[in-house]
């Protein structure tokens, strides 16, 4: 017998949609092989209607799809706008139609329930609004108008023009009678509930001359949209609930095992701690639509999510909702990268950010997640070179190592730098990732002077001490600008007294500027790297002043000042309306930092460089 399994019988009604789930053993071969849905003909052949390779027959065009869920060993065939002609015998299967693994499914599409002649059908989602139109003749214009609900053989009054409202519809129904000449009255029902489903009767007047019109109200629960995202990646839920609730609090919640819905985030400031640092609720558009972005997806994020609107910021019956079923694929295309990076006060971190390698030309960004209200993520740096002012001299985004990874370096760390940061691009939004920076006890491994004042026209020598564990690493000096950090020639000067516990293996790499020019003013970084992978960095600011006395100026280790004043993120970064989907500048207005002049020329700047035999350790 075939190991493929599904529903043996599926029954539906005309106009409906069905979701047929077919299960298969999730072996590696099965997960990746072709999936199909075919119809058995009289000849015994099975004609493909839709397959996982993108084929859709003309009969199914625009109304069917097949989605594979390899993790669960499931594929789902969705078919919409069913007609009686769709009744028949089908197969869902793997491989080739004629000799694959398959399962027989019988689909029966029947006519909808018999409705009285002239019945108008209204199909509306739960929580939405319906307007029932009720025509009448001139002679019934002055008479009572009413709407009844048919329950079995009886009719229950719902609302009438004498101000009666059935308690079940209190505060969500109104009857509108137009001005003279218009022979139609309307009944508007807001915040539809599943219990509102049924047959209604409009009536104007009484006795044999009365006007009647039947209305069949079908209230539908939203079918969850299937969302399949990669582990460690990102998902965006777009929620459009309609203008009626544009000014009502919005929420995203997750259905739990008790079938209640736990708030994940809402516009009233509530947020589930499990999503700390990796969720944003993007500001609503004028039409009331909004979106929620969740990054750093975990297996436990799987489940059914609902977005909705209610003044309490949580799920309530009869308010509009949208639904998604989120699956998290463990066979992720998104590479593993550290979710926590640790650095010491005064030290640095180098964060590796993954991006879709097919989008090497995309713009890269790094932003700081802020949890206040709905969350926001002001951009700090981008690959085009814009850096927030308060990060000048201590933040850089590098395209290296490339091929799906870029690097962000942040130095001169303070405790205020602890927090969550997002890596993103203007391309594939599913590759947004989150990293947490933690500031731990310890000393920076690289030691540079705090403040340096150079004299115009003279020679400046800046030392950078590194411990023996970095001896096998490549050492470099670079001049920071808002477009990156331009590497300068540097010189390795051998043992140093800065690291007493590392005896003769301590090293010194120094930068020489000769002669000093006005253009040399600015931030310089000393750093270590292995190939295209960056390790620690240390920053020093060089100020340039007019010549006072003759002679060269050498900054010795003993004269190294304290680190430059810490630069704290300005809490007043202004927000702009988020366009997170089209534009990854998540709620940030970038302040352009003016380029700090020409890079120092290689002929004037030099650093002594010599190799060391000792193997270096990790830079983290």
């Amino acid at each position: 017998k075939s190991p493929v399994f599904g529903p043996q019988e599926v029954s539906s009604v005309e106009g409906n949609s069905v979701s047929i789930k077919c299960y298969y053993p999730p072996t590696s071969v099965n997960r990746h092989t072709r999936k199909y849905w075919c119809r058995k003909g009289a000849s015994g052949r099975c004609i493909t209607l839709v397959s996982s390779e993108g084929y859709v027959s003309s009969n199914y065009a625009g109304r069917a799809n097949l989605t594979n869920f390899p993790e669960n060993g499931t594929f789902v065939v969705n078919i919409a706008q069913l007609s009686r002609d769709d009744s028949g015998h089908y197969k869902c299967g793997l491989g080739i139609n004629s000799r694959g693994l398959s399962f027989d499914v019988s689909l029966e599409v029947s006519q909808g329930p018999e409705l009285p002649n002239g019945t108008e059908v209204y199909t509306v989602d739960v929580g939405r609004t319906v307007t029932i139109k009720c025509p009448f003749k001139t002679e019934n214009a002055p008479k009572t108008k009413a709407l009844y609900k048919k329950i079995g053989q009886t009719s229950v009054l719902v609302i009438d023009s004498r101000n009666y409202v059935n308690p079940n519809y209190k505060d969500r129904i109104r009857l509108r009678i137009p001005g003279t000449g218009q022979l139609i009255f309307t009944v508007v029902i807001d915040r539809l509930r599943l219990s509102d489903h049924g047959l209604y009767l409009c009536q104007a007047g009484d006795g044999s001359n009365r006007d009647e019109k039947n209305a069949d109200l079908q209230v539908l629960e939203p079918e969850p949209e299937l969302v399949y995202e990669d582990l460690r990646g990102s998902v965006t839920f777009h929620c459009a609930l309609g203008l009626e609730v544009a000014n009502v609090a919005k929420f995203l919640c997750r259905v739990n095992s008790r079938e209640t819905c736990d708030v994940v985030i809402n516009t009233l400031g509530k947020r589930d701690s499990a999503f700390e640092g990796r969720i944003l609720l993007n500001p609503q558009d004028k039409d009331g639509s909004f979106s929620v972005v969740i990054t750093g997806l975990r297996k436990e994020d799987e489940g059914r999510y609902l977005c909705g609107a209610h003044s309490d910021g949580q799920l309530q019956e009869g308010w509009p909702i949208q639904a998604w079923q989120l699956f998290v694929n463990e066979e992720s295309t998104i590479p593993r990268s550290p979710t926590v990076v640790k650095g010491v006060a005064g030290g640095s971190v180098a964060v590796l950010c993954p991006y879709n390698p097919k989008e090497s030309q995309s713009l890269k960004y790094w932003c700081l997640w802020e949890g206040a209200q709905n969350g926001r993520c002001p951009l700090l740096v981008e690959s085009q070179g814009l850096v927030q002012e308060q990060y000048e001299g201590r933040l850089s985004l590098l395209q290296e190592p490339g091929n799906g990874t870029f690097t962000v370096i942040l130095n001169q760390l303070t405790t205020q730098d602890a927090g969550f940061y997002w890596c993103l691009t203007n391309g594939d939004t599913r590759w947004r990732t989150t990293v947490e920076i933690k500031i731990i006890e310890g000393e920076p491994n690289l030691k540079v002077p705090g403040n340096v004042t150079a004299v115009l026209g003279e020679t400046l020598n800046i030392p950078c001490h590194f411990p023996c564990k970095f001896s096998s690493y490549e050492k470099y000096w670079c001049k920071w600008s808002n477009t990156g950090c331009q590497t300068l020639p540097s010189q390795d000067e051998g043992p140093s007294e800065a690291f007493v516990n590392c005896d003769e293996n301590s090293r010194l790499v120094s930068l020489t500027l000769n002669p000093v020019t006005r253009a040399d003013e600015g931030w310089y970084w000393c750093g270590v790297k292995q190939g295209h992978f960056y390790g620690e960095t240390a920053a020093v600011y060089v100020a340039v002043e007019e010549k006072k006395v003759a002679g060269s100026r050498y900054v010795s280790p003993a004269k190294a000042d304290a680190a430059p004043d810490e630069k704290v993120l300005d809490s007043g970064v202004r927000e702009i309306e988020n366009k997170a989907i089209q534009d990854p500048r998540l709620f940030a207005e970038e302040k352009v930092v003016a380029d700090t002049g020409d890079q120092a020329g290689g002929s004037r700047a030099s650093v002594d460089s010599s190799s060391s035999e000792e193997q270096g350790g990790s830079s983290k």
Epitope: V10, V18, Y23, N72, V76, R304, A323
Partner: nanobody, 129 residues
């Protein structure tokens, strides 16, 4: 909280038939799934049949061993599921459990117990030869 109560079990001769009922109380499901599992002495619990409903659609699932002999259905009040069992044989002897859940949109194989949140106490079916 939802309670499930099975009934209709008993002793029947091989070739005979029985109709099991599973009544749910506590709430009505506008969409959901109700299934039947069975457990013979010394054996693992196994899937028998399930019925899933959502938005006017009904999906019926059967284990290979009962296809063509058993039929699952439910009443329109959405509170009771039935298992009509025919051509019974001694291998069908077991304790039959009813299981239910409100969320048919979980894409977990519903032959496994995992998708079902609510369970009944079971009703015994004995088929004598």
């Amino acid at each position: 909280e939802v309670q499930l109560v099975e009934s209709g079990g008993g002793l029947v001769q091989a070739g005979g038939s029985l109709r099991l009922s599973c009544a749910a109380s506590g709430r009505t499901f506008s969409s959901g799934i109700m299934g039947w599992f069975r457990q013979a002495p010394g054996k693992e619990r196994e899937f028998v049949a399930a019925i899933e409903w959502s938005g006017g659609n009904t999906y019926k699932y059967y284990a290979e061993s009962v296809k063509g002999r058993f039929a699952i259905s439910r009443d329109n009040a959405k509170t009771t599921a039935y298992l009509q069992m025919g051509s019974l044989n001694p291998e069908d002897t077991a304790l039959y459990y009813c299981a239910a859940d409100e969320s048919p949109s979980r894409y977990i194989d519903l032959r496994r117990p995992a998708p079902y949140h609510y369970w009944g106490q079971g009703t015994l079916v004995t088929v004598s030869s």
